[in-house]
Interface confidence: medium
């Protein structure tokens, strides 16, 4: 691969520990400025696997406000606005990065953790076991 | 609400810019084991509304590779498995954090960046109603 | 064989009514929509109207609104057209199609002509 | 109502020309444009849908393309059975309207 040479500006880290503990600047750039799943689409509730959205908060965690998707049926929902049982409404999940406060309730101090959430629901084929 | 005391224990912190620059330990506490989305669903395959998935890589990026997912029909795929234009495959997106290396190529200091990726795809009913 | 068979197409009088039928082989009927399409002499293609799988949604062109009922017999894989009040520019070949927003199979169409 | 207009409304052309019809919506209708062939005493035949995806046994010298107003069907090589008329159809509202047609004759 391209061995990309390091930055000469780069900040002098005496971490004992690094490469393993950076700096990270938490002044966010952020491209998208519509940050409520529920605002940003009403697909959620259009969808034939309608979903609905909860609210995950923790103050040890950034962002502390996660929202989790759950599918409300096991069907999906057919032509007629039936569920439909042949089908499965399933979630649809997602690894996402966040930072826990480590020690517990330090400002200045996280450790990254991989988590994994319910994003929205998708309706699929079910895997039919047949029975010999 | 509650105020939690400050852990006596956290590292002091002597940044100028603190609290917006933190330190943080990049020994990611992971719970889950499978990080490619091919492998832990067949999802995209199975649904009304399949996605294909892309690898989207960038070494200034931690994580440097990102799935996302693409739609692969403008419709729905109906129980003949036939592509029916009465419904629409839309992603569903979601807002991440990532970390950004900043200053370019420096491997200890980095900025959060939020990025707004589509983790799969739902089948839902147009707002534009084909038939009055 | 996917297959789409019209009927019931004629001489019919104006003010008259005529019943069109299409029966429908070789595919889940129920899954889809259907709908009609006509074509007048020397002339090009009409869509007319569609109904969604169920039979709860309906549309119509302007045309023929207020005078043609599309309906469906799921259990016999039938779909239907009532014409009622019928009038001379409605003289033309009928078509039935099955509905994916393209519509990807057609019926080989049946003829009404309205005339005294 | 959506008009659709379509141009020409007929063209002279050879075997192995190539030919472009195009199609315009009067009001923005995505990708939700079909073409359809039809020969004489025949019934239609689609051929492409979502304005750009072909239908299943049409013959890849077939291709659509455009979105919002503007839409064009494309024979990149004409062919002895591709003489025939051929029309756009908006599937974006009710009522689903075709375009007049475009008949393709022999130079």
């Known amino acids: 691969g391209i061995t990309i040479p390091r930055n000469p500006g780069c900040p002098n880290s005496e971490d004992k520990n690094f490469p393993r503990t950076v700096m990270v600047n938490l002044n966010i750039h952020n491209r998208n400025t519509n940050t409520n799943p529920k605002r940003s689409s009403d697909y959620y509730n259009r969808s034939t696997s309608p979903w609905n959205l909860h609210r995950n908060e923790d103050p040890e965690r950034y962002p502390s406000v996660i929202w989790e998707a759950k599918c409300r049926h096991l069907g999906c929902i057919n032509a007629d606005g039936n569920v439909d049982y042949h089908m499965n409404s399933v979630p649809i999940q997602q690894e996402i990065l966040v930072l826990r406060r480590e020690p517990p309730h330090c400002p200045n101090s996280f450790r990254l953790e991989k988590i994994l959430v319910s994003v929205g629901c998708t309706c699929v084929t079910p895997i039919v076991h047949h029975v010999a | 609400g509650i105020t939690i005391p400050r852990n006596p224990g956290c590292p002091n912190s002597e940044d100028k810019n603190f609290p917006r620059t933190v330190m943080v330990n990049l020994n990611i506490h992971n719970r889950n084991t499978n990080t490619n989305p091919k492998r832990s669903s067949d999802y995209y395959n199975r649904s009304t509304s399949p996605w294909n998935l892309h690898r989207n890589e960038d070494p200034e990026r931690y994580p440097s590779v990102i799935w996302e997912a693409k739609c692969r029909h403008l419709g729905c795929i109906n129980a003949d498995g036939n592509v029916d234009y009465h419904m629409n495959s839309v992603p569903i997106q979601q807002e991440i954090l990532v970390l950004r290396r900043e200053p370019p190529h420096c491997p200890n200091s980095f900025r959060l960046e939020k990025i707004l990726v589509s983790v799969g795809c739902t089948c839902v009913t147009p707002i534009v109603h084909h038939v009055a | 064989e996917v297959q789409l068979l019209e009927s019931g197409g004629g001489l019919v009088q104006p003010g008259g009514s005529l019943r069109l039928s299409c029966a429908a082989s070789?595919?889940?009927?129920?899954?889809?929509?259907m709908g009609w399409v006509r074509q007048a002499p020397g002339k090009g293609l009409e869509w007319v109207s569609s109904?969604?799988?169920?039979?709860?949604?309906?549309g119509y062109a302007d045309s023929v609104k207020g005078r043609f009922t599309i309906s469906r017999d799921n259990s016999k894989n039938t779909l239907y057209l009532q014409m009622n009040s019928l009038r001379a520019e409605d003289t033309a070949v009928y078509y039935c199609?099955?509905?994916?927003?393209?519509?990807?199979?057609w019926g080989q169409g049946t003829t009404v002509t309205v005339s005294s | 109502d959506i008009q659709m207009t379509q141009s020409p409304s007929s063209l002279s052309a050879s075997v192995g020309d190539r030919v472009t019809v195009t199609c315009r919506a009067s009001?923005?209708?995505?990708?939700?444009l079909n073409w359809y062939q039809q020969k004489p005493g025949k019934a239609p035949q689609l051929l492409i849908y979502?304005?750009?995806n072909l239908q299943g046994g049409v013959p890849s010298r077939f291709s659509g393309s455009g979105s919002g107003t503007d839409f064009t069907l494309t024979i990149s090589s004409l062919q002895p059975e591709d003489f025939a008329t051929y029309y756009c159809?908006?599937?974006?509202?009710?009522?689903?309207?075709f375009g007049q047609g475009t008949k393709v004759d022999l130079k």
């Open positions: 009001q923005s209708i995505s990708i939700y």
């Open positions: 159809q908006q599937s974006y509202i009710t009522p689903r309207t």
């Open positions: 199609a099955r509905d994916l927003g393209g519509m990807d199979v």
């Open positions: 979502g304005a750009s």
């Open positions: 109904i969604r799988p169920s039979g709860g949604m309906t």
């Open positions: 070789g595919f889940t009927f129920s899954f889809y929509w």
